[in-house]
Each structure stands twice: as C-alpha cells, then as structure tokens.
C-alpha cells in the first residue's frame, strides 16, 4: 500500500513539476527590465526564451520574436536546450509511469516490468528536473553577470557628449517558476525510484523440506518452496514433496524403520 | 551598437516653422520611447517632448501647442515639427531613445545634437 501510496504521490509530483517546466519555457518574464520612470507613463521591458516584450502603463504591449540577426548569444540556444530535453524527457518519463502505476493493471504485466518502468521514469524525471535547474540557473547566472556590468559608461560621439545608460535586468517570475518546477520533478523522479524498490520482486529462498511418505510411495524430485512475486521456476508457490522429512542439503537415504509414524 | 542621428537643424526666423528627424539604427528589438530635449548655451539640458512606443506622449509646457512629436515604429525614428519659433527655443536639440537590443539588453542613448537658431 506505501508503495502504491509512493509511486502514485510521485507521479503526481512530476506531473505538476513538467507542467511547471513547460509554462516556464513559454512564459516571457525570464528577465524583467526595471521601470523607466517618465512624467506620463512607465514602460517596461520583459523578455523569454522566445521573444522580447514592451509594456506600458496606458496597457499597450508590443511583442517581438528574437531573430538571427540579433546574433543571440550561445548562452540562450544552450538554455532552450536544455529546456526542451527537460520536457522530453519529463514527457517520456510521464508515458512510461503511466503504464508503470501499480494501482493500473495492462494485462499480465508483471511486477518486475513494472519495477523496471518505475525506476526507468524516476531516472527520466531526475534528468528532466535536473536539466530545468540547469537551464534555469544559467540564464539566471547571465543576469547576475549582466546587472554588475551595467553601469553608466560615457564616451563622446560626433558632435557633443553622448551618454549611454545600460538598464538592469533582474529574475522574471519565469525562473522561480523554473526552479520550483525542477525540484518538484526532481522529487517525484527521486519517489519513484524509491517506489521501485518497494516494487521490485525479491527472491527469498527458504531452505525447503522434503517429507517422506511410507516405503512404498513414489518419490517426488526434491524442489523447494520458493517465495517468489515471478521469479524463477516455482511460479506458482506449490510445495514439491519427495516423501520424507529430510532437508534438501542432507544426502538422500531409503526409508527406514524409523520413517513409520 | 545602437547609434542615434539627428537632422533638419538650422537658422529659421522667428515665428516659422522646423521639421527635426532623429533614426536609430543599429540591432533594435524595440526602441521604447524616443525624445527631444534641448540645452540653450548656460543653461541645464531640459526636456522638449516624448513619445512611447505606444503612442503616449508628454510636453513641455513651454512647448504645449506649438510644437508637434510624431514617429514611425518600423523605422525606429521620431518626428519633431516645430511651428511659432520664438528666439527662446535657440538651442541644441538632443534626441534621446530608451531601446532594447538584445537578450536583457538595453539602455538610454542621446544622439550627437543639432543646432537650430531662431533670429528675431
């Protein structure tokens, strides 16, 4: 039942996580522009993985896509990378715990298939979440290198003075939606797995007893009881019987006077 | 990167009429808002007018009723038609644009100046 209770909690936790990783990937506040302050109106600058956006105050908002001849830095290709092999991922992750669930029945699936597709997702939704921290981290690291070198420079141009203002850009509420998306995915990748071992068939032999019925009665070929959830020959739990009560290591002997009851 | 250039400046008489241009070019996603300020010899540079990228725009009051700022988006350049001219608005005039152009980049760029003298 706790690892029906697991598996379960773990899904749902990942399935919140890539839901949030995938809002986060397509949201537009990764980075937010401080407020230009102007007597009339404040306009404001917020940008994603995908396009740059303008707003202002009177509710006017211009959207653009970034293009080639912005000639986009490495860092951003490497973030959207990372971003898309995140929900991939996580996507998979999701299809294969689905069949995985202990509480789903597909079949005669057994509880080994099913052991092995829950740790196959858990370690999909580990990648996944990983890879969205990852990603999520890097740009935020960009911002942090960006505001500390955006400081007022001046230099002189043709015909005066000409002064350039750099404007800071600080964390949208893309990258703490990001950042809580990952580690949820990562939690649920981390409860699978652990469900996995919940679920995972152990092979417990018990040293099996054989019993000897009189001297006349046919002799069955010694065989164990096997505590078994599908693993190896005795799959049906059957106690094997060889007539008298000797254990399977000591030397097999004929019935004896001793054998009657 | 991003580079502002001013035009349409010079001698005009009093009561006639200006047309000043400014472009920005350069890699522009957006260029938020663009405007005028001015600086007469001695004085403090002081804002003449601007415009967002949405349309709002804001005056001097000095200016309120005379002068007329206008732009075009797709080509990134502001408008200032200057109409009543009196010998109080000799200055340099200065076009000033707030522009995005990269990834978290951006900031506020002043174009070089134009003279525009009024002789009584």
């Known amino acids: 039942m706790a690892v029906t209770a697991c598996q379960g909690l773990g899904f749902v936790v990942s399935l919140i996580g890539i839901a949030g990783i995938i809002a986060a990937t397509c949201m537009d506040q990764w980075s937010t522009q401080d407020l230009y302050n102007n007597p009339v109106t404040a306009v404001f600058n917020y940008q994603g993985l995908w396009r740059s956006c303008v707003r202002e105050s009177s509710g006017f908002t211009e959207c653009r896509g970034y293009f080639t001849l912005l000639g986009l830095p490495a860092m951003l290709q490497a973030v959207r990378a990372l971003m898309i092999v995140g929900i991939v991922l996580g996507a998979i992750g999701l299809l294969v715990s689905i069949f995985a669930l202990k509480c789903i029945r597909i079949g005669s699936m057994e509880d080994s298939a099913k052991a092995n597709m829950t740790l196959t997702s858990g370690i999909m939704f580990i990648v996944s979440g990983l890879c969205a921290i990852a990603g999520v981290s890097v740009f935020a690291n960009m911002l942090v290198t960006n505001f500390w070198m955006s400081t007022a420079n001046m230099y002189t141009g043709m015909g005066g003075m000409v002064q350039t203002v750099q404007t800071r850009y600080t964390f949208g509420a893309a990258l703490f939606v990001g950042w809580v998306a990952g580690g949820l995915t990562l939690i649920g990748g981390v409860m699978m797995c652990i469900a996995c071992r919940g679920l995972a068939p152990e092979e417990t032999n018990y040293k099996a007893v054989s019993y000897h019925a009189s001297g006349h009665s046919v002799a069955y070929k010694p065989g164990g009881f096997k505590a078994s959830t599908g693993f190896g020959s005795n799959t049906k739990n059957k106690k094997i019987y060889d007539g008298g009560a000797r254990t399977e290591d000591e030397v097999q002997s004929y019935p004896s006077k001793h054998d009657y009851v | 990167q991003v580079k502002l250039e001013e035009s349409g400046g010079g001698l005009v008489q009093a009561g006639g009429s200006l047309g000043l241009s400014c472009a920005a070019s350069g890699t522009i996603l957006h260029v938020m808002v663009m405007g005028w300020y001015r600086q007469a010899p001695g004085k403090q540079r002081e804002l003449v007018a601007t415009q967002t990228i949405g349309g709002t725009t804001n005056y001097a009051d000095s200016v309120k009723g005379r002068f007329t700022i206008s732009r075009d988006n797709a080509k990134n350049t502001v408008y200032l038609q200057m109409n009543t001219l009196t010998p109080g608005d000799t200055a340099v005039y200065y076009c000033?644009?707030?522009?995005?152009?990269?990834?978290?980049?951006?900031?506020?760029?002043w174009g070089p100046g134009t003279q525009v003298t009024v002789s009584s």
């Open positions: 000033n644009a707030d522009v995005v152009y990269g990834l978290a980049r951006s900031g506020n760029y």
